[in-house]
Interface confidence: low
């Protein structure tokens, strides 16, 4: 027999299948051009001294063989004696170590058996009704295919699935989507409706993230507020990385989880923009305001659960930085200006009340006045800080108020609203004898003392009703008692107390009359 022909004689080895576990398998035969054909197969086991024979039986019952030697691939033409237009049965017999090993048979019509490619190029992945949908362009001239997929997770072996028949120039497959683990998919194709046609190779891996991106497990710390009124947010713990199946390790496009940082500035609600989203790697500087910080994880299927932290406001106060002048027309605040063309946000809220009750006002961009100060004024009619109570004031500044991460804290301080000089007048002034020439004066704390840094001092005034002489005694703001000495028995005195702030003299309390009784000796 000629080597290019299928030899219609008995093969040169005994016909006895060894039944061994090794041997030829996975036989594929297809047309590779208008008149040429190729069969290829795998051989399992030691290859030394193995001779392969491709066997073919025609529908008439006549059988022939091609001798392939040690090769596991063989080409022949339509003139080789094998009927290509009718169904034939092919298998491989391998003669090794004095025994014959046989592959499973394939029955097919060679002319219509085309070598099918796996999906090539881009495989688009999307989510459809809780399942995974893959879509790809059908390889050229290969419309009409059966498609299979296999998939695995980091902890499970390959599982096989069926995509069903495809008859279009785009093909698609619905596959299971895992909730919490990444998957690796591969696809393969074979000719539709061609009996015994061979499967293509598996496609390149398609790496698919879980439906739910992993919840970010991160921790933040925030530094002290610097001289510039800003503090740095730092990441203490990086997010955990997703475990990937074997074929997705290294470069695995599709499984990426992106983490974004969402900042919500809670203070100064009257500003234009309250939230900003940043990449997690780019840690921002914050003002001393209160913030909510969320880390949002997302993958190609969308966002997952987020983790939220509250960053409280920096409550470090600057008692001397703010000057407040109260006039007949209203109130004006002055503070050291930050720079040219700054927008300021002045926020105030009654002390001891929920942060949600803060009120604020945004200034137009302003330059420093000749004394280097920035100002904010309001009229009495506006009602701003009009009640006689303690307010916590914070002033923020920004040259770009629309950019959330460019605000800084100028100062935080306390202010007593309304008519502070009258409201702060001490009440319940009482006088008790202390010794033969001294008395102890006590009073209830001024309302101003509820406002840290506002009450500068108490002043106690004692007036001798006979000589009309007056003496004044300054008392520390933390004290509510003073001893007046050097008094004379039998003389009438009046005592008054007032509470002063740094910028306002208080109103005297009602005069309290007293005298030290003359001691009569026996």
């Amino acid at each position: 027999c000629r080597t290019s022909e299928c030899c219609f004689q008995d093969p040169p080895y005994p016909d006895a299948d060894s039944g061994s576990a090794s041997g030829p398998r996975d036989l594929r035969c297809y047309r590779i051009s208008s008149d040429r054909y190729e069969c290829s197969w795998q051989y399992e086991g030691p290859t030394a001294g193995v001779s392969h024979f491709l066997r073919c039986c025609l529908s008439s019952g006549r059988c022939c063989y091609f001798a392939a030697g040690s090769a596991t691939r063989l080409q022949f033409s339509d003139q080789a004696g094998v009927s290509v237009l009718y169904t034939v049965t092919l298998w491989v017999e391998s003669w090794a170590r004095n025994q014959t090993e046989k592959s499973p048979e394939v029955t097919l019509q060679l002319y219509n058996s085309v070598k099918y490619e796996p999906p090539l190029g881009d495989i688009k992945v999307s989510k459809l009704a809780g399942q995974l949908r893959m879509e790809w362009e059908t390889p050229d001239n290969q419309v009409g295919a059966e498609v299979q997929f296999r998939h695995r997770t980091p902890s499970s072996p390959w599982k096989l699935g069926d995509c069903g028949p495809q008859d279009d120039d785009t093909e698609s497959c619905l596959c299971p989507l895992e909730m919490n683990v990444a998957q690796e998919f591969q696809l393969r194709r074979r000719q539709l409706g061609s009996q015994g046609s061979s499967w293509s190779k598996w496609s390149s891996p398609v790496c698919v993230p879980p439906e739910n991106p992993p919840q970010p497990q991160v921790r933040f710390s925030v530094e002290q507020l610097g001289q510039d009124g800003r503090r740095r947010l730092t990441l203490k713990e990086q997010p955990t990385q997703l475990e990937l199946p074997e074929g997705c390790q290294g470069l695995a496009p599709g499984t990426e989880v992106t983490y974004r940082l969402q900042l919500h500035m809670l203070s100064c609600p009257c500003k234009a923009k309250a939230t900003r989203t940043l990449h997690l790697g780019k840690m921002p500087y914050l003002s001393g305001a209160a913030y909510n910080v969320a880390v949002i994880s997302s993958n190609q299927f969308g966002p997952g659960l987020n983790q939220t932290w509250h960053i409280p406001a920096d409550t470090h106060t600057e008692p001397v930085a703010l000057n407040i002048s109260v006039g007949t027309n209203g109130t004006t605040m002055y503070w050291p200006a930050r720079a040219q063309s700054m927008t300021y946000c002045i926020e105030w809220q009654p002390v001891g009340q929920d942060g949600g009750l803060a009120t604020c006002s945004l200034t137009a961009p302003q330059d420093p006045d000749p004394a280097g100060m920035a100002t904010y004024s309001w009229s009495r009619e506006s009602g701003a800080m009009g009640q006689e109570k303690c307010y916590y004031i914070t002033i923020f500044a920004s040259a770009h108020p629309e950019k959330l991460t460019l605000w800084s804290t100028v100062l935080s301080t306390y202010h007593f609203g309304g008519n502070a000089s009258a409201a702060g007048t001490p009440h319940h002034v009482s006088v008790k004898n202390h010794s033969l020439d001294s008395v102890s004066v006590d009073w209830a704390p001024s309302l101003l003392s509820t406002c840290p840094g506002v009450l500068k001092e108490y002043v106690v005034r004692c007036r001798d009703e006979d000589s009309k002489q007056v003496s004044e005694h300054p008392v520390q703001p933390t004290e509510t008692q003073v001893t007046l000495s050097g008094l004379r028995a039998g003389v009438a005195y009046t005592v008054q107390v007032r509470a002063d702030t740094a910028w306002l003299r208080g109103v005297w309390s009602q005069p309290q009359r007293f005298s030290i009784e003359v001691q009569v000796s026996d």
């Epitope: 069903g164 028949p165 008859d167 279009d168 120039d169 785009t170 409706g193």
Partner: nanobody, 118 residues
């Protein structure tokens, strides 16, 4: 539940035109092939035209050049524009969608009558 509702049938003179419409619901329309078939009295049902999800079309030899199938993925609609109608085009026209495991059309509508008079 998959539903296909045909409309646009009626009586027309030979040489005239008709446009059939079909509203499809209950399947992922944009990922499926859609088709029109017809059945004349006493005859077998025949596939008239088919359009795949990527807008590839096939026509029966008897209607080539006269009938045009089209689809609107946004509206889940399929259309059959029938021009130069002949008396032999008289039949009940059915709209079909989806693929069965054999590759055939899986679902069919109730049909709309088209009558071409000479």
């Amino acid at each position: 539940e998959v539903q296909l509702v045909e409309s646009g049938g009626g009586l027309v003179q030979a040489g005239g035109s008709l446009r059939l419409s079909c509203a499809v619901s209950g399947i992922a329309f944009r990922y499926n092939s859609v088709a029109w078939s017809r059945q004349a009295p006493g005859s077998q049902r025949e596939l008239v035209a088919r359009i795949t999800n990527s807008a590839r079309t096939n026509y029966a030899d008897s209607v080539k050049g006269r009938f045009t199938i089209s689809r609107d993925n946004d509206k889940n609609m399929v259309y059959l524009q029938m021009n130069s109608l002949k008396p032999e085009d008289t039949a009940v026209y059915y709209c079909g969608a989806g693929r069965s495991m054999t590759g055939d059309v899986a679902y069919w509508g109730q049909g709309t009558q088209v009558t071409v008079s000479s």
